[in-house]
């Protein structure tokens, strides 16, 4: 059972039956930090059912205490979480891993981004690395349009100051592994890739470590490529309308298009009693089209003022771009002014100017 991709890998499995007292891990965490203890199976073999124990008492999973067969995670650690932790085989109660955990008042925020990238003793309690802003590291998936720039950050602290390295899909990641290279800022705990391409897709892991432990975070990068398409018109627009003679009417058409769309409003007409030409193409008249000073927003609305019976009929919003055309149509019914207003159909709406 995985506890997510943010891992504090500090435990090591004992290679002998039951660890000697001197083999227990001495670990220091900052208050508010996430404590993660890892206990892989000895020799890499099957582990079987395990239990995690703190100060001799079995740990009960909760929202804050996440228990897995090989890993224990305690979120938002406090002084009360200090103590002796062990991972044991459930059946035999044999101790597989043992940890001594101390939670101190180490700072949990504030990136010293311009600090020296040297592992020096600051005089503060020595301790394993921890994320300086863990609440900022919840998001794991980054989807970016091709040709833009990506930055992954893993700001951390610890004493001695930890080092940071990067993996792509679990392997060491260096500048020569991608065209355009990468830019690293150890003081900002960051990796930058300029002008990303589809081959940059993958899992990127920062590994932050010092002699007291190691933490890691994995991000997934997706690079998006646009496939051009003809305009998309919002469903249900324009809508059928019923209006009273002399009132005003508006038809709306919402157009979505990558390429700049060309929008026209057409009214279907009859020629010699026929609605379509010999080739089946409808007869139409153009009511509104792009001009020097018309905006797309203006073109998405067709306004009819003081409607007459001649305005009744079928109206079409036609949108085209370099890929192709799309169109939606709607009907206008015009009622005499003295008649009761009735809806033309369930989709129509009534405008009484």
């Amino acid at each position: 059972e995985s506890l997510g991709t943010e891992q504090r890998v500090v435990g090591r499995a004992a290679e002998v039956p039951g660890p000697e007292p001197g083999q227990q891990e001495q670990l220091v965490f900052g208050s508010g930090d996430a404590v993660e203890l890892s206990c892989p199976p000895p020799g890499g073999g099957p582990m079987g059912p395990t239990v995690w124990v703190k100060d001799g008492t079995g740990l009960v999973p909760s929202e804050r205490v996440l228990v897995g067969p090989q890993r224990l995670q305690v979120l938002n650690a406090s002084h009360e979480d200090s103590g002796a932790y062990s991972c044991r085989q459930r059946l035999t109660q044999r101790v597989l891993c043992h940890f001594s955990v101390r939670v101190t008042d180490a700072p949990s925020s504030g990136d010293d981004e311009d600090g020296e990238d040297e592992a020096e003793d600051t005089g503060v309690d020595t301790g394993a690395p921890y994320w300086t802003r863990p609440e900022r590291m919840d998001k794991k998936l980054l989807a970016v349009p091709a040709a833009n720039t990506v930055r992954f950050r893993c700001p951390a602290a610890g004493n001695p100051t930890p080092s940071i390295s990067w993996l792509k899909n679990g392997r060491e990641f260096r500048g020569e592994h991608r065209i355009g290279g990468i830019k690293l800022r150890h003081q900002q705990w960051s990796l930058v890739m300029e002008s990303v391409v589809p081959s940059d897709r993958g899992n990127y892991t920062c590994v932050v470590e010092n002699k007291f432990g190691s933490i890691r975070q994995t991000y997934t990068l997706d690079v998006l490529e646009r496939s051009p398409h003809r305009p998309i018109l919002q469903a249900g627009l324009p809508a059928n309308q019923t209006a009273v003679l002399g009132s005003d009417v508006e038809f709306h058409c919402k157009v979505y298009s990558d390429a700049q769309p060309h929008i026209q409003w057409l009214k279907h007409v009859e020629v010699n009693g026929s609605k379509v030409g010999p080739d089946g193409t409808p007869y139409v008249t153009v009511l509104k089209t792009a001009g020097a000073n018309t905006t797309d927003k203006e073109l998405e609305v067709l306004s009819l003022h003081n409607v007459t019976f001649e305005d009744a009929g079928e109206y079409t919003c036609l949108a085209g771009n370099s890929i192709g055309f799309s169109h939606h149509s709607a009907w206008l019914v015009v009622l005499p002014a003295e008649e009761e207003l009735v809806e033309a159909d369930e989709a129509g709406s009534v405008y009484a100017g």
């Epitope: 802003r133 900022r136 980054l142 349009p145 833009n148 720039t149 930055r151 900002q188 646009r226 990558d258």
Partner: antibody, heavy 127, light 107 residues
Framework: EVQLVESGGGLVQPGGSLRLSCAAS????????ISWVRQAPGKGLEWVGR????????NYADSVKGRFTISADTSKNTAYLQMNSLRAEDTAVYYC????????????????????WGQGTLVTVSS | DIQMTQSPSSLSASVGDRVTITCRAS??????LAWYKQKPGKAPKLLIY???FLYSGVPSRFSGSGSGTDFTLTISSLQPEDFATYYC?????????FGQGTKVEIK
């Protein structure tokens, strides 16, 4: 080679309209954005607005919101700045610039960087 | 809006000098800061992005540093072509805003 060429500038009366064009070449137009930046004579740079042709999303400076509209025609690799209700204070050299985003999960915004600029076109609003 | 204040507004220097320009934001902009160079009658050119990343093709004598509200552009050894006006610009907040510029003149 990335190139941006602005056109459409000129003299216009207050209250009038003008449409500037920015013809782009040498890069994938739909992946990055186009920003418009202006510079009044002898003054500093002022960001006007930005479009991302991929989804048509636009952003504007408050000083031009409601008067200026940015659009793009990806089939022509061209961006436009439609300027209506022009005022004397809109007099400036207008630059278009290719704009890319720096995407970073650690922060809740996208940093926008303008890396290639056109030569600029002068718009003079005067009666 | 986030105000960007550059200092000094102008400075005189000689070829070979080390020049430092500072930019202060009215609120925290993290590392979302770019530096541009502009010569009279020409379009601006990008030098630095994300506070400290040198844009490709820009000479290594240019460097940027800082985060939060205080930023610095340094030219380690001024060259004749570096006499120009330099602008900082933030894009963490909307709208993007520029500093008023720093003019670097020949002494």
């Amino acid at each position: 080679e990335v190139q941006l060429v602005e056109s459409g500038g000129g003299l216009v009366q207050p209250g009038g309209s003008l449409r500037l064009s920015c013809a782009a070449s040498g890069f994938t137009f739909t992946s990055t954005g186009i920003s418009w930046v202006r510079q009044a004579p002898g003054k500093g740079l002022e960001w006007v607005g930005r479009i991302y042709p991929t989804n048509g999303s636009t952003n504007y400076a408050d000083s031009v919101k409601g008067r200026f509209t940015i659009s793009a025609d990806t089939s022509k690799n061209t961006a436009y700045l439609q300027m209506n209700s022009l005022r004397a204070e809109d007099t400036a050299v207008y630059y278009c610039a290719r704009t890319y985003g720096i995407y970073d999960l650690y922060v809740d915004y996208t940093e926008y960087v303008m890396d290639y600029w056109g030569q600029g076109t002068l718009v003079t609003v005067s009666s | 809006d986030i105000q960007m204040t550059q200092s000094p507004s102008s400075l005189s220097a000689s070829v070979g000098d080390r020049v430092t320009i500072t930019c202060r934001a009215s609120q925290d902009v993290d590392t979302s800061l770019a530096w541009y160079k502009q010569k009279p009658g020409k379009a601006p050119k990008l030098l630095i992005y994300s506070a400290s990343f040198l844009y490709s093709g820009v000479p290594s004598r240019f460097s940027g540093s800082g985060s939060g509200t205080d930023f610095t552009l340094t030219i380690s050894s001024l060259q004749p072509e570096d006499f120009a006006t330099y602008y900082c610009q933030q894009s963490t907040g909307h709208p993007q805003t520029f500093g008023q510029g720093t003019k670097v003149e020949i002494k």
